[in-house]
């Protein structure tokens, strides 16, 4: 190899300036005694490069772009030799920005797979290769002081979001959070949250189901719908709250939200709505009294209003 | 502290009928679902029933459907397992217990030991 | 119903053992298992919930693992006050199902 390559940094803030010196070998000047280095930044030719001979015979060109404007490019220099140009070394210059602080960082316990999930937003892009990293740790206060680490979550490549799973969790017990991003530029972290795992849980929706009916039981007045649903048996013994909505299916009706449910409801005459027509009904449930988060809405459940009520029924609730 | 003291077993004869008690204290009685269950001599443990925050909710085993009635009363801090029809091998030391939220029972009373004998 | 089979049903072993019981469900309970120690003529103590967390006031020495179907409870190092049974429960669905108990009695 006649030539080499070497720069002030190979990654830089988009923008910055960049300095490069190429050094031709002296047992290289055969190609020609006094040899002009050219330099090149992707296909183009790049002036202002300022050669001279060294001690030792050698030659060498250094060039300084005073604004690296390209967040991937190689530069290179070269001789000319006959009518083509001889790359003599290239290298890779990238160039981005550290990356921003991670932001809206927040989890979920997620019972089913006993584990906590949590997401953030990364933020601008770098135009480097950034890795983030959720770190955390067990603390028996509000976090202020450290206990036993656990080990960090690394997403997938391109993901926002990591699962620490039930083994490095304590239920129950405070848990220090946060993201750290780090790219050759620097490092960023977000904010730290402070979180019982159990506060952010996230429940699954009970099943709704119409009211089987029973020979004792009034039928349903017109505009009214007999509902039951059947709770999630997991989180059974979690008090919850919950809220059912409904609309018409024909139409272009929003929907409307009834709730908070009488707790421990686990079926409701819903009346007010329009007779001999078809509904769709959804459920979702959160911990009541404790934080939490909102299940998704349940899988629809499709029912029709009666067509007329008898005269001698009272719109009645059940509790 | 958190405390359970059940209360009111004893020796009935088979088709009889009996009431336990277990009062609690040291926490919120109303918010958490609370349970019984029993033993019988020498065996393992068996879940008899539980109830909801509000007394909403009632589970039972299979082995005292129909025969034994769970129910709370929030303002006594105190829950009740009514059993009726009692059979020999409804004979066990009966525990009443606070439930967590994922359904383990802690802590538990002192038991209290129902006998179906003739 | 979702039953709950323990083994062994009873060990011995001696102090400062390691000692493993193993307990398996009938269908997928997730996390929802619990474990108990239970000494003669005395009401069961909560020792791990949610298959692995660990009961405040429980020693160390005590660990869970598993889901699905298979846990485990894991004494590090047996103590004296250790001899008890070991009761399993799964508390994914009603009705809520204990194991048969391990007697664990000094070797």
């Known amino acids: 190899e006649c030539g080499h390559i070497s720069v002030s940094a190979p990654i830089v803030h988009l923008g910055d300036p960049i300095t490069a010196s190429c050094i031709i070998k002296q047992n290289c000047s055969h190609l020609d005694p006094e040899p002009q280095i050219l330099w090149r930044l992707g296909a183009e030719l790049q002036p202002g490069g300022r050669q001279q001979r060294l001690s030792d015979g050698t030659q060498e060109s250094i060039i300084t772009l005073p604004h690296l404007n390209h967040t991937q490019a190689f530069l290179s220099c070269a001789l000319n030799w006959g009518n083509s140009l001889q790359i003599l070394d290239q290298v890779e210059l990238r160039a981005g920005y550290p990356p921003a602080i991670p932001h809206n960082l927040s989890c979920l316990m997620n019972l089913t797979t006993s584990s906590l999930i949590c997401q953030w937003e990364p933020g601008p892009e770098t135009h480097l290769p950034t890795s983030f990293t959720l770190k955390s740790f067990k603390s028996r206060g509000n976090c202020q002081t450290q206990g036993d680490s656990i080990l960090d979550c690394v997403p997938k490549d391109g993901q926002s979001h990591c699962s620490i799973p039930r083994k490095h969790l304590l239920l129950y017990q405070n848990m220090g959070i946060w993201v750290q991003a780090e790219n050759a530029l620097g490092t960023s972290m977000s904010p730290q949250l402070c979180l019982d795992p159990m506060d952010v849980v996230k429940l699954e929706p009970p099943m709704l189901r119409t009211m089987d009916p029973s020979p004792e039981a009034a039928p349903p007045q017109a505009g009214c719908l007999q509902l039951s649903w059947e709770p999630w048996q997991p989180g059974l013994h979690i008090n919850q709250k919950c809220e059912l909505r409904h609309k018409p299916q024909r139409g272009e009706a929003s929907w409307a939200l009834v709730g908070p449910l009488p707790l421990e409801a686990l079926q409701y005459e819903l009346c007010g709505l329009l007779p001999a027509t078809a509904y769709t009904l959804q459920i979702r449930c959160i911990r009541w009294a404790l934080p939490g988060h909102w299940s998704d809405w349940s899988p629809s459940l499709e029912l029709r209003t009666t067509e007329r009520a008898p005269t001698h029924h009272h719109h009645h609730h059940h509790h | 502290e958190v405390q359970l003291l059940e209360s009111g077993g004893g020796l009935v004869q088979p088709g009889g009928s009996l009431r336990l008690s277990c009062a609690a204290s040291?926490?919120?009685?109303?918010?958490?679902?609370m349970g019984w269950v029993r033993q019988a001599p020498g065996k393992g443990l068996e879940w008899v029933s539980s109830?909801?925050?509000?007394?909403?909710?009632?589970p039972y085993a299979d082995s005292v459907k129909g025969r034994f009635t769970i129910s709370r009363d929030n303002s006594k801090n105190t829950l009740y397992l009514q059993m009726n029809s009692l059979r020999a091998e409804d004979t066990a030391v009966y525990y009443c217990?606070?439930?967590?939220?994922?359904?383990?029972?802690?802590?538990w009373g002192q038991g209290t030991l129902v006998t179906v004998s003739s | 119903d979702i039953q709950m089979t323990q083994s062994p049903s009873s060990l011995s072993a001696s102090v400062g053992d390691r000692v493993t019981i193993t307990c398996r469900a009938s269908?997928?309970?997730?996390?929802?298992l619990n474990w108990y120690q239970q000494k003669p003529g005395k009401a069961p103590k909560l020792l791990i919930y949610?298959?692995?967390n660990l009961q405040n006031g429980v020693p160390s020495r005590f660990s869970g693992s598993g889901s699905g179907t298979d846990f485990t409870l894991t004494i590090s190092s047996l103590q004296p006050e250790d001899f008890a049974t070991y009761y399993c429960?799964?508390?994914?669905?009603?009705?809520?199902?204990f194991g048969g108990g391990t007697k664990v009695e000094i070797k």
């Open positions: 949610y298959a692995s």
């Open positions: 429960q799964q508390s994914y669905s009603t009705p809520l199902t």
């Open positions: 217990a606070k439930l967590g939220e994922l359904g383990w029972f802690d802590p």
């Open positions: 269908q997928g309970i997730s996390s929802y």
């Open positions: 040291g926490f919120t009685f109303s918010l958490y679902w």
């Open positions: 109830i909801s925050s509000s007394g909403g909710v009632t």
